[in-house]
Structure formats: C-alpha cells, structure tokens
C-alpha cells in the first residue's frame, strides 16, 4: 500500500429542489473540455454558499454527475450539459459518484486522473 493512493468510489442519488437562485453549483467537463484525462464526464467544481446544493449538504466539489433526471451525461458537450441542468425543472434528481481518498485502507480503487488533485 505504501506509495499508493487508494480511493473509495460510491454512488448516490441526490434529489434537489431548485431554490430561488437555482441549484447552486458549477460544473466543468464535457467532450470538448475534459477535466480529467481521458474522461469527458461532468464534475462539480463549485458549491455556492446558501444554494440548494449547499443546504442539502450531500453534493461535494469533485463529485462526478452521472445523470440528471435519469438522463445520462456521457458524451455531452460542456454547454449541452449546462443547458440540461438549466432546463431540468423544479425537482432535480442527480446520480453522483463520490470519490473518497482512503489512507491505506483495504477497500479502494486505484485512481487514475484523480479529479480531486
């Protein structure tokens, strides 16, 4: 284990209700704007203070968003992903992948292109 970084990858369904200022987060990624090498996925880059996502508390910077209201986010241009969120309606269901760094733990996933730096 020494000299190796391990990650525990989990998935979660997060249901957000759009607040007065929206969902309250930023994203990076897309086929035209890869955030992680060889991965065109959509990642959370900022959680805005007092926004819907921050108040819910589960979505974290660095999370990968796999789907919105059941619609897969694979192979989307960045702006198309942004538009998908903006048009997602009042109740928004997000399928997200959390990636937690673990210190020499027995359970983990060897991470390549780590989005958390």
């Amino acid at each position: 284990m020494n000299g190796r970084v391990d990650y525990l990858v989990t998935e979660e369904e997060i249901n957000l209700t759009r607040g007065p200022s929206g969902l309250g987060f930023n994203i990076v990624g897309g086929t035209d704007q890869q955030y992680v090498s060889n991965d065109s996925g959509i990642y959370v880059s900022r959680i805005k203070e007092n926004g819907a996502a921050a108040l819910d508390g589960r979505l974290q910077e660095g999370d990968k968003i796999l789907s919105v209201n059941g619609q897969d986010l694979k192979n989307l241009l960045h702006q198309d992903a942004v538009d998908l969120f903006r048009n997602a309606g009042y109740a928004v269901s997000l399928r997200v992948q959390h990636r937690l760094q673990v210190q020499n733990g027995p359970i983990g996933h060897r991470g390549e292109g780590d989005p958390s730096g």
Partner: nanobody, 128 residues
Framework: DVQLVESGGGLVQAGGSLRLSCAAS????????MGWFRQRPGKERDVVAT????????YYLDSVKGRFTISRDNAKNTVFLQMNSLKPEDTAVYYC??????????????????????WGQGTQVTVS
C-alpha cells in the same frame, strides 16, 4: 481542499515593482478561479484582481488598473500579480484566494462575484 502559498512580497520604494506568485495544490488548478486580495492597516480586506478558471476574464480594482496585471500559468499551477508603479497606499498584506470555477448550472450571472473560500496565509508588501 486547496492549499495556497504566496511569495514575492517585500519592501520596495515608491515607483518600483514587485511580482507576487501563488502556488496552488490539492485539486486541478485549471478548474479554479483565482484572485488577489489585500488588507491595508486598519481596513477591510479588499479584492485587488481576479482571473477566471479559463483565463479569459479578469477584474481589477479601479485604483490598480493600468498598474497591476494578474495572470496564470496552468502548467505551473501558479497565479501571478505583477505590480508596477507602486504607491505607498499599496502597502498591505496581499492574500491569494481561490474558488471552484466552471459554469453555473443556474444562469450566466454569477451571484457572489467575489465569494472566494480558499485562502493563502498572505505576504506583506511595503511601499516606502
């Protein structure tokens, strides 16, 4: 979390120049909006200059426009503040700051324009 380490501060005569650097680690630098803030003696901390994650949008405090230039080097995970024609009133502790960049999923307008939440320890700039 993001760690920020500033360098380049010091004592300089009025009219002189300094270049501040801020090295970031902890997450991909290219996804971060970066900024320089300063706190002058007995004053609130003010934004001096900011640069967005893509490097194509900058902001400057009116009193530093034309004298200070903010830039970033994504290959080196570093943001710079080139300060020319320094004045005694530029004396302050200068702080590097960061926040997640990216596109808002809500609207083009970004509420809380100077809402930064990762901070360096600061570097002293004294202009005599």
């Amino acid at each position: 979390d993001v760690q920020l380490v500033e360098s380049g501060g010091g004592l300089v005569q009025a009219g002189g120049s300094l270049r501040l650097s801020c090295a970031a680690s902890g997450r991909p630098f290219s996804s971060l909006d970066m900024g320089w803030f300063r706190q002058r003696p007995g004053k609130e901390r003010d934004v001096v200059a900011t640069i967005n994650w893509t490097g194509d949008s900058t902001y400057y405090l009116d009193s530093v426009k034309g004298r200070f230039t903010i830039s970033r080097d994504n290959a080196k995970n570093t943001v710079f503040l080139q300060m020319n024609s320094l004045k005694p009133e530029d004396t302050a502790v200068y702080y590097c700051a960061a926040r997640g960049g990216g596109s808002s999923v809500d609207s083009e307008y970004d509420v809380g324009e100077f809402e930064y939440y990762y901070w360096g320890q600061g570097t002293q700039v004294t202009v005599s």
